[in-house]
């Protein structure tokens, strides 16, 4: 029975080229994690695997950094980085647990006055 | 390279208790599960339960709840299961073997450890 | 508490294809129950080839795969080789434990 839960920050704004911290955290399982992935709709963004550490995607190298923790570092966001992002927990022996965190990037101007669930 | 080496060869009375160790190397010790599985002579398999390396709990399959223990030692890279009230039917080959989350289950096992529970 | 069975024994040539497969006394076998096939081979031990259904450790050769084949779990060898010759295990989860069928003895001749 896979009884964990994964909280994540939720749904997050942020302004254009500023960053942001994704985050997700699994509770309520004995599970053992062996590995996350973070992922944008279809596209693999990073990798931290138990053995081998980090992987982050070639063509996000520039604008993605690992942690804090389990967690992701998204820099120099653009308005094309609004949309939904996974965090996917494979663990053993429950197997995969995913998280989902919604993230707008607005303009600087509307971001300042609207943040709603901004990250410290 | 990965490897998991087991404690030696063990003769037991009926009754007795017997501790089994599992040395990992080749890897983070606390970044993957352990499980205990046991094969009797001319036997299948036996999953006996698994210990959360990195918080230290373990979970035990119902039929040795309350005869078994599996416990850490971090600092050596060591898992131990013990089995208590021993009768012949205990008679076995003992396995530790590694839990991964990626594509779930187990991939590297010890050697084996033979437990002879005899009067 | 579940029974998985596996056929005893079969036989294959060097070359040819052979399927093993792992069913469930509860019904279809799903990806939840995260297939495992273990190999063991006379005086060596276990070796974990697939895990997770269809994944295949970083030693297991190409030759194995795993998948879902008519609700069993299935074990595919394509071009067996005499090395193959040994005893094969399959294991499923069951929410909070793992059950292993008997074993199926393999025959490269």
């Known amino acids: 029975m896979m009884t964990g839960t994964i909280e994540t920050t939720g749904n997050i704004s942020a302004e254009k080229g500023g960053s942001i911290i994704l985050q997700c955290h699994l509770s309520s399982t004995t599970a053992q994690v062996t590995q996350v992935n973070w992922e944008q709709q279809d596209q693999l963004l990073a990798i931290c695997n138990a053995d081998l550490g980090w992987h982050i995607s070639p063509s996000f190298k520039d604008r993605v950094a690992p942690g804090p923790g389990l967690g992701l570092t998204l820099q120099s966001l653009t308005v094309n980085d609004t949309g939904e992002y996974f965090c996917i927990y494979h663990t053993y022996p429950d197997g995969t647990y995913t998280g989902r965190i919604f993230l707008e990037v607005l303009e600087s101007s509307v971001a300042e006055h609207g943040a709603r669930f901004q990250i410290p | 390279q990965v490897q998991l080496v087991q404690s030696g060869a063990e003769v037991k009375k009926p009754g007795a208790s017997v501790k089994v160790s599992c040395k990992a190397s080749?890897?983070?010790?606390?970044?993957?599960?352990m499980n205990w599985v046991r094969q009797a002579p001319g036997q299948g398999l036996e999953w006996m339960g698994w210990?959360?390396?990195?918080?230290?709990?373990?979970t035990y399959a119902q039929k040795f709840q309350g005869r078994v223990t599996m416990t850490l030692d971090t600092s050596t890279s060591t898992a131990y299961m013990e089995l208590s009230s021993l009768r012949s039917e205990d008679t076995a080959v003992y396995y530790c073997?590694?839990?991964?989350?990626?594509?779930?289950?187990?991939?590297?096992w010890g050697q084996g450890t033979l437990v002879t529970v005899s009067s | 508490q579940a029974v998985v069975t596996q056929e005893p024994s079969l036989t294959v040539s060097p070359g040819g294809t052979v399927t093993l497969t792992c069913g469930s006394s509860?019904?279809?076998?799903?990806?939840?129950?995260?297939a495992n096939w273990v190999q063991q081979k006379p005086g060596q031990a276990f070796r974990g080839l697939i895990r997770?259904?269809?994944g295949r450790g970083s030693w297991t050769p190409a030759r194995f795969s795993g998948s879902l084949l008519g609700g069993k779990a299935a074990l595919t060898i394509s071009g067996a080789q005499p090395e193959d010759e040994a005893e094969y295990y399959c294991?499923?989860?069951?929410?909070?434990?793992?059950?292993f069928g008997g074993g199926t003895k393999l025959t490269v001749l």
């Open positions: 080749g890897y983070t010790f606390t970044n993957y599960g």
């Open positions: 294991a499923l989860w069951f929410s909070n434990h793992w059950v």
């Open positions: 210990i959360n390396t990195y918080t230290g709990e373990p």
């Open positions: 073997s590694r839990g991964n989350g990626y594509y779930v289950g187990m991939d590297y």
């Open positions: 509860t019904g279809a076998v799903t990806t939840s129950n995260h």
């Open positions: 997770g259904t269809n």
